[in-house]
């Protein structure tokens, strides 16, 4: 039994590290391995992760982790029983993935904009809390090429456009994703998509 | 809830023993290193001992060493102090505390007082 | 050992004002710790890896310093601030304390 392809780790700066990797065949990740995993720390200890299958040789591991700083280093030990497969480390601040937003919605009801809002997915206490910005993408259901993006680059979770950027009649769907520069993060996963029907007053014409 | 509950202390001559007790709930005790710490009455903490989660790494301070014994058993979420040769300057309340990775105590009991004196 | 020396011992001062706590370290450290105690009352923890304010430790707190100095600030005091600040550091065994700086209403 070897490693493929060495394990990959993102952290969500909160509470779990993902961990994953690929071995050279099929493999039952829950029953022949477990990912050992430790802060570089006086007296710390040592955590086990039972991984699950990605795939029929993939595997992926959610370690939990009680917060992160940014001077956490952690070491990483795969196992098969007894003997180890590979031995790295994990540096959760330099690679962040963060958490997606949640609870999108569009009120529709502001006259003849469009507001878009949605949750920050972390605490206050959180150090990411204050240094997400957004990217939030809204298409046509019935037309493929009418598809955009919006960056949102201040902090406040909401976006205001005008209905008549969108055409009138149709249904479209929204989604927000984040990530935050201070740390170089990767952008998050998106978030669940919203669905609204866009319709607007058109302006009387002048001949 | 997190809860840490020491039992044990009480009064003592100089050169005798006691076996303080700190009974563990609201989380898995078999993950946590912990430790005893404890403080002479009006005086400033001072750290006594640590016992990894698996027993395998044991700490003591140099004031206690070879005279006290910390021990647990994961499967009654105990963790215990056997203290023996007691002097006068052994005299505190006893707190047990959970360790953190990072480094510090993130859970403390109430306290168990332990006073030696003839 | 490491040993912590704090001071002032005591710190009189009126709610509104800027407490400053200090921990001499007699050798360098990697991060220092500090916990709040309360009469009658166990320690809690207040700030870990020096600067990190733990779980509902309002914002007025922080912390700062570097090898052998290091400061817990409190912006504005509040009345439940009053209480002695004892900092710890976890770099070498035995884990010692500094024999804390009470904080009390002028």
């Known amino acids: 039994m070897k490693v493929l392809q060495e394990p990959t780790c993102v952290s969500d700066y909160m509470s779990i590290s993902t961990c994953e990797w690929k071995m050279n065949g099929p493999t039952n990740c829950s029953t022949e391995l477990r990912l050992l995993y430790q802060l570089v720390f006086l007296l710390s200890e040592a955590h086990t992760c039972i991984p699950e299958n990605n795939g029929g040789a993939g595997c992926v591991c959610h370690l939990l982790m009680d917060d992160v700083v940014s001077a956490d280093n952690y070491t990483l030990d795969l196992w098969a029983g007894q003997q180890l497969l590979w031995k790295g480390s994990f540096k959760p601040s330099e690679h962040v993935k963060p958490r997606a937003p949640g609870n999108l919605t569009v009120h529709t009801n502001v006259s003849d904009t469009l507001l878009l809002t949605w949750s920050n997915p972390y605490p206050p206490d959180n150090y990411l809390y204050n240094h997400l910005t957004y990217a939030v993408n809204i298409w046509s259901e019935n037309d493929p090429a009418d598809f955009r993006i919006y960056n949102v680059t201040y902090l406040e979770p909401s976006l205001r456009i005008a209905a008549s950027t969108l055409k009138s009649g149709i249904s479209y769907r929204a989604r927000v994703r984040a990530w935050a520069q201070c740390y170089n993060t990767t952008w998050s996963e998106w978030s669940p998509s919203t669905k609204w029907h866009n319709s607007y007053r058109e302006p009387f014409e002048q001949h | 809830e997190v809860q840490l509950v020491e039992s044990g202390g009480g009064l003592v001559q100089p050169g005798g023993s006691l076996r303080l007790s700190c009974a563990a709930s609201?989380?898995?005790?078999?993950?946590?290193?912990i430790h005893w710490v404890r403080q002479a009455p009006g005086k400033g903490l001072e750290w006594v001992s640590y016992i990894r989660s698996d027993s395998s790494i044991i700490h003591y301070a140099d004031t206690v060493k070879g005279r006290f014994t910390i021990s647990r058993d994961n499967a009654k979420n105990s963790l215990y102090l056997q203290m023996n040769s007691l002097r006068a300057e052994d005299t505190a309340v006893y707190y047990c505390?959970?360790?953190?990775?990072?480094?510090?105590?993130?859970?403390w009991g109430q306290g168990t007082l332990v006073t030696v004196s003839s | 050992e490491i040993v912590l020396t704090q001071s002032p011992a005591t710190l009189s001062l009126s709610p509104g004002e800027r407490a400053t706590l200090s921990c001499s370290a007699s050798?360098?450290?990697?991060?220092m710790y500090w916990y709040q105690q309360k009469p009658g009352q166990a320690p809690r923890p207040w700030i870990y890896l020096t600067s990190n304010l733990a779980s509902g430790v309002p914002a007025r707190f922080s912390g700062s310093g570097s090898g052998t100095d290091f400061t817990l600030t409190i912006s504005s005091l509040e009345p439940e601030d009053f209480a002695v600040y004892y900092c710890q550091q976890w770099t070498s065994i035995p884990f010692t304390f500094g024999q804390g700086t009470k904080v009390e209403i002028k």
């Open positions: 505390a959970r360790g953190r990775d990072r480094g510090y105590f993130d859970y």
């Open positions: 050798s360098s450290v990697s991060y």
């Open positions: 609201g989380f898995t005790f078999s993950d946590y290193g």
